[in-house]
């Protein structure tokens, strides 16, 4: 008899094996029927091992060995043994952000009979492999809760019968895709033509971002570094050397493994400073002996629209004004508190326009003519005095919460024209005839 | 599997214009920043242009600046480049790529641009 | 613009040999340096992005090294695949610039 019948190695197309027979016989005959599905095979050998080739991959064979000897045959023993499946190969993959459906070939003739066991893992981290294996005659399989934009390797193993596996696997590196940014926001800096975009990095791996800013024909493109999502940080950056006052489109895009998510996009535009100050200064002509007409020019709106205008009348020195000068009124300068007041008050918005950067408004006004605006009263002008003018314009106008109507100058956006030419005023007309 | 196909390269005088194209497959075309990179025989690798997703800003190397194009639609899933004004110093293979983060990631098999009287 | 010196300009290495390519910019570039393969007749092979890690598919005997101006690509166990031209390129800042190239040959 033959027992203990060893598979001692198997692969697609070769069996080694061995076995035992009570004693030591040496002129043992041993006949081997193999047989398959595909037929059936004679073979004998003096050895108490045999190499079977020309097999078919993924195939169970029979083999059953008969000891002879002197024309006498012992009692047969029989095992069975699967051939390996051949390799798979052209793994193909295709991602989303936390998933992979991945598809292969096998071109064994018993492929419909082999079921595949894939074995996923996360580049550096091979502890936590993820085992998948697919339904016999199924070539593909969709893997999921990946993390996204990273790197993964997988190995699939064609299996047949009871867990007898390809010698090698097919191997297949890919990505995830990344995840886009679900957000962020802007922020204006204020007094500086910048923006702080600020965001929480978005779930997975990421090599960086693209950054895109743009308005009409300008546009700006740069590198963002990675950040990473674990601890729910904010992250931030500063836009630079933008204008004042202007919108701009703005997109972030999520780059890891080389691929690049969808973008996300904002409009944002940027805050004001104190408008530019204008070269000229404002023109002021006589009327009468107590008033005066003050022509100027709108200011610049390159740092934000203007909204305001105040005009500033001195008799002092026409040194270059402050803000300090705005908290004046014309009683305090009759009081003699001040050589210099704000005598008239202008709202922009009040006009009912929209002023484009381009377009240059012209005002005109009468000083003295005893109107109030606001916190301000325009007061008669005294005859024989020697006044300038001056304009203050305001792209943020605050106002005093205490003293009701009267500017703060440190809380509010303004610049200053020089001082005019001084003009001086007639005798009032009646201290003549009087 | 992402693939990058271009064509429209040929023999073209001096002074007159040509228009590539570099048709993307396997990837989300419109997500993508996409260049391209010549390279003159035997010589090394020049980038040409380059263009965003989000806006479709686009970016010239100076010697090309006025002369060529880059443009996209991401319907077609289709890079162009419109070459005006050619010389001789613009015959190349040319090449598109993605270009994610600065880097060429991934690359067509180039047309030939060959510009002689 | 950034200048990309790559030295050595030609190269020979025995199989088995472990090879060294040496990329220098003009400027401060980050991190933002990618090493490309090419061989005769083909299309430029992404290798390493971003200084160091290693493209998809790449064997793990590439890798590279480096941030700011200087930066190395370092091949271990030369093999006859890796023959062919090797690139750097700084993607930090337009006109983005490549190095001359390096020629490898297997001796």
């Known amino acids: 008899a033959v027992f203990d019948i060893h598979v001692v190695y198997v692969t697609t197309t070769e069996m080694w094996l061995d076995w035992k027979s009570p004693d030591g016989a040496s002129e043992y005959v041993y006949h081997l029927v193999i047989e398959s599905k595909h037929g059936s095979n004679h073979t004998s050998t003096y050895d108490k091992a045999i190499t079977l080739q020309g097999l078919i991959p993924g195939t169970l064979y029979n083999i059953t060995i008969s000891p002879e000897v002197d024309h006498v045959w012992g009692d047969p023993n029989s095992t069975a043994q699967y051939t390996r499946p051949s390799n798979v190969s052209n793994i193909d993959v295709s991602t989303n952000t936390t998933a992979a459906t991945l598809s292969w070939q096998n071109f064994d003739d018993a492929s419909p009979t082999y079921s595949y066991c894939l074995l996923i893992e996360k580049a550096g981290n091979s502890s936590n492999a993820t085992q998948v294996v697919t339904d016999i005659g199924i070539t593909d399989a969709t893997v999921t809760e990946l993390i996204p934009g990273s790197s993964y390797t997988v190995e699939i193993f064609a299996q047949v019968g009871d867990g007898i596996k390809s010698l090698e696997p097919g191997r297949k590196s890919f990505c995830t895709d990344p995840a886009s940014m679900a957000s962020f926001d802007c922020e204006v800096v204020p007094k500086e033509p910048a923006l702080v975009l600020k965001w929480t990095c978005p779930p997975g791996a990421n090599a960086g971002f693209e950054l895109e800013v743009s308005s009409g024909a300008w546009n700006n493109a740069t590198h963002l570094e990675s950040c990473s999502s674990e601890n729910g940080t904010e992250y931030r950056t500063e836009v630079t050397y933008l204008n004042f006052s202007t919108s701009y489109n703005i997109s972030i895009t999520t780059v890891s493994c080389g691929k690049m998510a969808a973008p996300t996009r904002n409009t944002c535009t940027t805050g004001i400073t104190d408008p530019p100050p204008p070269d000229g200064s404002p023109n002021i002509t006589s009327v009468s002996h107590n008033s005066v007409k003050v022509k100027f020019s709108g200011f610049e709106a390159s740092h934000g629209p203007i909204k305001a205008y105040a005009v500033i009348l001195t008799t002092g020195e026409a040194g270059h004004p402050s803000a300090d000068v705005l908290k004046y009124t014309y009683e305090d300068f009759k009081k003699g508190a001040s050589d210099t007041y704000v005598t008239y008050l202008i709202r922009t918005e009040e006009k009912g326009r929209s002023q484009s950067l381009s377009e240059v408004l012209k005002y005109e006004i009468d000083v003295g003519n005893e109107s109030t605006t606001l916190g301000y009263y325009n007061g008669k002008l005294e005859p024989l005095g020697s006044y300038r003018a001056c304009v203050a314009g305001f792209t943020n106008i605050t106002f005093h919460p205490q003293n009701k109507g009267l500017i703060d100058g440190a809380e509010s956006y303004v610049s200053f024209s020089r001082y005019s030419d001084a003009v001086s005023l007639p005798q009032d007309p009646g201290v003549i005839c009087g | 599997e992402v693939k990058l196909v271009e064509s429209g390269g040929g023999l073209v005088q001096p002074g007159r214009s040509l228009k590539l194209s570099c048709a993307a497959s396997?990837?989300?075309?419109?997500?993508?920043?996409m260049a391209w990179v010549r390279q003159a025989p035997t010589k090394g690798l020049e980038w040409v242009a380059y263009?965003?997703?989000?806006?479709?800003?686009?970016y010239y190397r100076d010697s090309v600046k006025g002369r060529f194009t880059i443009s996209r639609d991401n319907a077609k899933s289709t890079l162009y480049l419109q070459m005006d004004s050619l010389r001789s110093e613009d015959a190349a293979t040319y090449y598109c790529?993605?270009?994610?983060?600065?880097?060429?990631?991934?690359w067509g098999q180039g047309t030939l641009v060959t510009v002689s009287s | 613009d950034i200048q990309m010196t790559q030295t050595p300009h030609s190269l020979s290495a025995s199989l088995g040999e472990t090879v060294s390519i040496e990329c220098l910019a003009s400027?401060?570039?980050?991190?933002?340096l990618a090493w490309y393969q090419q061989k005769p007749g083909k299309s430029p092979q992404l290798l390493i992005s971003?200084?160091?890690p290693l493209h998809d598919g790449v064997p793990s005997r590439f890798s590279g090294s480096g941030s700011g101006t200087q930066f190395s690509l370092k091949i271990r166990n030369m093999q006859p695949e890796d023959e062919g031209v090797y690139y750097c390129?700084?993607?930090?800042?337009?006109?983005?610039?490549f190095g001359a190239g390096t020629k490898l040959e297997l001796t």
């Open positions: 396997g990837f989300t075309f419109s997500n993508y920043y």
């Open positions: 400027e401060g570039i980050s991190n933002y």
């Open positions: 971003y200084a160091n």
């Open positions: 263009i965003t997703n989000g806006f479709g800003s686009t």
């Open positions: 790529s993605t270009v994610p983060l600065g880097a060429f990631v991934s």
């Open positions: 390129q700084q993607g930090y800042k337009f006109p983005y610039t």
